[in-house]
């Protein structure tokens, strides 16, 4: 679909005559009839197959035609067509004289024709005007023409329909050749597919409008490239949705069990070394000068007996101070002003001269130590007992008194609380997190089933004839104390009446 446009520019009829040569009275009131038809090698009369158009009276004799509406007509003249433009045409332009106001063909005398021109040729669709001028003996007509496509029609033949749109069915404008040109943010054959946010994951994300990134189930993040872990996952991650892969140091289905208490809670104080020993469990190895489960207790600095040669130690705010005995000096009373002649070695130690008698060394007997053999050996100074065990000096040796639940020379071994069979009288032992529990057999109670619970043998009233019943606690049996006139273990026989037997 398109329009053939004809722009009349100037008509010259200087003598004001008709085609017959007869002059117009008073002048030639000129209007035009245009006929557009298919290409003919020789343009002949017949139907105007592509259309016709007439103008109103545009002027008298010679005149120029304005570019806009003129007396109700239009310039350029429009000849619309509703078919594919064939690229060739024939055009007939007739100039007529209008003696009156009625311009219909049947109302005009046949000799009212002023001039007639006929052209034919090829014409491509385009915006450019073709200028032409046709001259006859008495007249001259200057005009231009072109073919353009109607709105929404494109291509060389105006055969391509394209209507811009921005709705659910497409988001595009039309190129000069009729092809679609998608609006920014849209793609696809009909520009119906939005272009998602740059980087939006192809499989895990989608969008319903441009620059959007909506995540499919199980995915999250601006670009939908992060999986969502299983609901309840505490210290874990995922590589595909709904997984829970535990971080280092965590266990359990939901990674909520702390396998690395040391790292996560730093329970050991004062520079102690922490060792994980199972779920929510740890052991602190204290630095010298500290004690306690978490090495939170500071030992007195004098506890390590830093003063030698019998020096006495005094605790101070910023450390300690050694008070040296006569003949010694230095931070730890380590320097001697004595020689072997002064008999400096105590507790049977033997003296050996050093540096040509300027110094000496004591060789101590067993169980004594120190520069002058002045100290009894204390084998507990190195805190050898683990897990809060108490160190005890026993003459030349030492021993550890362990806390419940630990054993070994240094209390280094965890033991089952039930291993030492703590439940008396056949009680069943159950290990618990913080100790043990005994399930006692009938007749016993107490934390360790150590209490005998007497069974009241008299509860069933075994004695007859108003006898008094007593429980024998040693055997859990009963004894009947019979009233006068009755005998038998249950006082069931009257005195003097022997029991009757069936045989």
């Amino acid at each position: 679909s398109g329009v053939f446009q004809l722009q009349l520019q100037e008509f010259i009829n200087e003598r004001g005559v008709l085609a017959s040569g007869r002059p117009c009275e008073p002048g030639c009131r000129t209007f035009f009839r245009v006929c557009l038809k298919h290409f003919q090698a020789v343009v002949s009369p017949g139907p105007c197959t592509f259309g016709t158009v007439s103008t109103p009276v545009l002027g008298t004799n010679s005149f120029a035609v304005r570019d806009d509406s003129s007396g109700g007509g239009r310039n350029p003249l429009q000849l619309p067509f509703n078919f594919t433009w064939p690229g060739t045409f024939s055009l007939i332009i007739e100039a007529w004289h209008a003696p009156g106001d009625d311009l219909r063909p049947e109302a005009l005398p046949p000799d009212a024709l002023i001039s007639k021109i006929a052209i034919q040729g090829s014409l491509a669709v385009g915006q450019n005007w073709l200028l032409d001028e046709q001259t006859s003996t008495l007249t001259r007509l200057r005009y231009s023409y072109r073919v353009i496509c109607s709105d929404n029609y494109y291509g060389d033949n105006c055969s391509r329909l394209c209507k811009k749109r921005n709705d659910h069915f497409g988001h595009y404008v039309c190129q000069p050749d009729g092809n679609l040109s998608c609006l920014p943010g849209w793609t696809g054959e009909y520009c119906q597919q939005p272009i998602c946010l740059s980087g939006c994951h192809e499989q895990n994300g989608y969008c319903s409008k441009p620059a959007e990134c909506l995540c499919r189930p199980g995915w999250q993040g601006r670009l939908c490239n992060e999986c969502i872990p299983h609901n309840g996952c505490r210290h874990g991650t995922c590589s595909t949705p709904w997984q829970c892969t535990c971080d280092e140091g965590w266990g359990g289905l939901f990674c909520d069990q702390d396998l690395n208490y040391c790292t996560h809670h730093s329970p050991c104080k004062n520079g102690a070394t922490c060792s994980n020993s199972g779920q929510r469990s740890y052991t602190c190895t204290c630095r010298p000068g500290y004690t306690g489960v978490d090495c939170e207790l500071e030992l007195s600095e004098c506890d390590s007996n830093p003063c030698r040669n019998g020096g006495s130690c005094k605790d101070q705010e910023d450390g300690y101070h050694c008070l040296c005995p006569p003949g010694y000096y230095g931070l730890h009373c380590e320097h001697s002003t004595l020689s072997c002649a002064d008999s400096p070695c105590f507790n049977g130690g033997s003296c050996r001269e050093r540096n040509q008698g300027a110094n000496y060394a004591c060789e101590c007997p067993p169980n004594f130590t120190g520069s002058n053999c002045e100290k009894k050996v204390d084998r507990c100074t190195s805190n050898p007992c683990a897990n809060g065990g108490q160190c005890l000096n026993r003459g030349p040796s030492r021993m550890c008194r362990c806390r419940p639940g630990f054993t070994g020379t240094y209390c280094e071994l965890h033991v089952s609380d039930c291993a030492r069979n703590p439940c008396a009288h056949g009680g069943t032992c159950h290990d618990l997190e913080n100790g043990l529990m005994c399930t006692c057999p009938a007749g016993f109670s107490g934390r360790r089933c150590e209490v005998r619970t007497s069974i009241d043998a008299c509860a069933s009233s075994p004695c007859f004839n108003r006898a008094t019943c007593y429980t024998d606690l040693s055997t859990d049996t009963f004894v009947c104390n019979c009233p006068y006139g009755f005998v038998g273990s249950r006082c069931e026989f009257p005195v003097g009446l022997p029991p009757s037997f069936p045989w």
């Epitope: 996952c233 535990c246 266990g251 289905l253 990674c255």
Partner: nanobody, 120 residues
């Protein structure tokens, strides 16, 4: 394809017992730890028990300790959860799960769940 199918759920009175089963397929059963978690309406899931691939290590949540027992039969590719002394607060959907490794550390695959209702 890894599959875990739970069964044995149902309605039981308080103090009663149930035994849940989890039948596994699609992987080498005795290579993987298997566990149970449960989810009550409107609550977060709770890991209640797990058994390592060898069966040597088990763990229980405090809320079920002493009442529930987990076991596995590697010959039958099945894990069991024996639930005794059931309470109304044990009402939930019970799911079988595996971390896809030998130790009880995480969840990789889960079943569809079986409903347990404890009510008088």
């Amino acid at each position: 394809k890894v599959q875990l199918v739970e069964s044995g759920g149902g309605l039981v009175q308080p103090g009663g017992s149930l035994r849940l089963s989890c039948a596994a397929s699609g992987f080498t059963f005795d290579d993987y730890a298997i566990g149970w978690f449960r989810q009550a309406p409107g609550k977060e899931p709770e890991g209640i028990s797990c058994i390592s691939s060898s069966g040597g290590i088990t763990y229980y949540a405090d809320s079920v300790k002493g009442r529930f027992t987990i076991s596995r039969d590697n010959a039958k590719n099945t894990v069991y959860l024996q639930m005794n002394s059931l309470k109304p607060e044990d009402t939930a959907v019970y799911y079988c799960a595996t971390p896809g490794i030998a130790a009880c550390r995480g969840i990789h695959y889960t079943g569809q769940g079986t409903q347990v209702t404890v009510s008088s």
